[in-house]
């Protein structure tokens, strides 16, 4: 299949909300629960998420929310006591009105005339804001993640079903399937749909086989497919790389630990603007590439690629994507050169052969122009020690 066309992208930063909200059928999400299918109900009001009013929370709304989130039906709908004492009971006759302050900041309610999300609407200021909050536990605690890909937007596809994380078999796995994964996770669109062994193999059950998404589904479990079969092994675990995943390389230097900083993001390689490239950013990049620490930041050259990415790190992050970042889609770096770095493991410093990659870092080439770095959890802990 051809790759789904990327949606129009506005300027983006690490502080903004996801490109696609998890509950896009209904402006709702569940928070502070054991999974994405249980917790306190929050509804989206323009730019913010607000806890839904518990006083008007009923079984129809609970059922609709669970269905909309792809979590089966509702197992239990309840109310959570408010974080502060509830407002006093109705005032005695003749008392002056307290409504002005208490109600203008009222809490929204999710009101449903049936158990289907199409029959629901969000009503603003429907309850006093100090009241109880709506909570739900859905019958199917389903969730999705990408693992061992060096970030939340690349890696082996894993689904949570029946309390267990498991893989998806790569039979018939293609860009439409990966696109559904990327969109569901708020990771943009699929850059690559990868067969087994591009990422470390999984260990748990194999939940799905012969997945065949159209690309329009909101959740991977809405796609046609079969339950994981015994003949599908972990050598065939499906993977995905999404447009919002960032991977880095250094080019034009003596080796892979020296050169111009380039980031693969939204399907293309971009240079990084040196106007905000400081020692803390260089340190994070060198360490994440397994190249030691940053020795210097040579003067940059004019941008040979699209230069649109800015980073701001404190120096303690594991990768640049954990830093605050800004991708300017409409303008190339203004009055800026392409950032460069020389890391301590570069052979141009030591006049040695190509540096060994530390055991904690595994580099997997997934196509001629894309490299994804993988760290497993154990080795990351060792590195932190």
């Amino acid at each position: 299949h051809p790759s789904p066309a990327p949606p129009d992208q506005l300027n983006t930063s690490s502080a903004e909300s996801e490109l696609w909200e998890p509950g896009e059928r209904l402006p709702v999400r569940l928070t502070n629960g054991s999974s994405s299918c249980s917790g306190t109900v929050e509804v989206r009001l323009e730019a913010s998420w607000e806890p839904a009013c518990g006083a008007l929370w009923d079984s129809r709304a609970a059922e609709a929310v669970c269905r909309a989130l792809g979590c089966g039906g509702a197992e239990a709908a309840s109310q959570l006591a408010p974080p502060t004492p509830e407002l006093p009971p109705p005032p005695a006759a003749g008392n002056t009105s307290v409504a002005a302050n208490a109600t203008l900041a009222g809490a929204p309610a999710l009101l449903c005339s049936g158990a289907e999300w199409r029959l629901c609407e969000v009503v603003e200021h429907a309850c006093r804001s100090d009241g109880r909050r709506a909570r739900v536990t859905c019958a199917e605690n389903r969730a999705l993640r990408l693992v061992d890909g060096g970030g939340a937007c690349a890696g082996r596809v894993e689904m949570l079903e029946h309390g267990e994380w498991g893989s998806v078999c790569d039979d018939t796995w293609d860009l439409e399937d990966a696109h559904v994964v990327c969109r569901q996770l708020g990771c943009g669109w699929a850059v690559q749909a990868l067969p087994g062994l591009h990422f470390t193999p999984g260990r748990g059950p194999i939940h799905r086989d012969q997945v065949n998404c159209s690309g329009a589904e909101a959740y991977l479990w809405d796609c046609p497919g079969l339950p994981g079969q015994h003949y599908c092994g972990h050598k065939e675990d499906a993977g995905a790389v999404c447009s919002e995943h960032q991977s880095w390389r250094l080019t034009g230097g003596a080796d892979r630990c020296e050169g111009q900083v380039e980031v693969h993001f939204r399907g293309v390689w971009n240079t990084v603007c040196d106007s905000e490239w400081y020692p803390s950013e260089a340190k994070v990049l060198c360490q994440s590439l397994g190249c030691g620490t940053a020795v210097e930041r040579p003067k940059g050259l004019p941008h040979s690629l699209s230069g649109r990415m800015y980073y701001s790190c404190n120096g303690e992050e594991l990768t640049l994507s954990n830093c605050s970042w800004r991708f300017n889609n409409s303008n190339l770096c203004s009055q800026s050169l392409a950032a460069r770095v020389l890391c301590s493991a570069s052979r141009s410093l030591h006049n040695l052969s190509t540096p060994e990659v530390p055991a904690s870092v595994q580099t997997v080439t997934i196509e001629s122009s894309v490299t994804v770095k993988i760290e497993n959890k154990e080795s990351r802990e060792l590195m932190l020690l």
Epitope: L87, N95, A100, T103, H125, A126, C127
Partner: nanobody
């Protein structure tokens, strides 16, 4: 104790209009979210429409959406229900309700009920 008094009911032909009114004795009328419920012959009480304290948010039962309009006038302690394109199935006793904690969409949040006014659509 809030006293709610409905008025404006009566007999009307199908397709016609009626305007129900509810007045409250309470000076702190604006502290309450208000609404209308109805009970048809041999039926359970059902929600019709609700409005929040300041009048900025309204909610309607699917069966009356686009035909009924709820509004309030806090200065006059009055709740109104404009009913257009009436149908025989709208025949019921209409109750004015008041709620302190939330819009009166579900019966368990309602603090006060009026005595009701009869609407008959022939």
């Amino acid at each position: 104790q809030v006293q709610l008094q409905e008025s404006g009911g009566g007999l009307v032909q199908a397709g016609g209009s009626l305007r129900l009114s509810c007045t409250a004795s309470e000076r702190t009328f604006s502290d309450y979210a208000l609404g209308w419920f109805r009970q048809g012959p041999g039926k359970e009480r059902e929600f019709v429409a609700a409005i929040n304290w300041v009048g900025g948010s309204t909610y309607y039962a699917d069966s009356v959406k686009g035909r009924f309009t709820i509004s309030r006038d806090n200065a006059k302690n009055t709740l109104l229900l404009q009913m257009n394109s009436l149908k025989p199935e709208d025949t019921a006793v209409y109750f004015c309700v008041a709620s302190w904690g939330a819009m009166p969409v579900l019966t368990h949040v309602i603090n006060y009920w009026g005595k009701g006014t009869q609407v008959t659509v022939s």
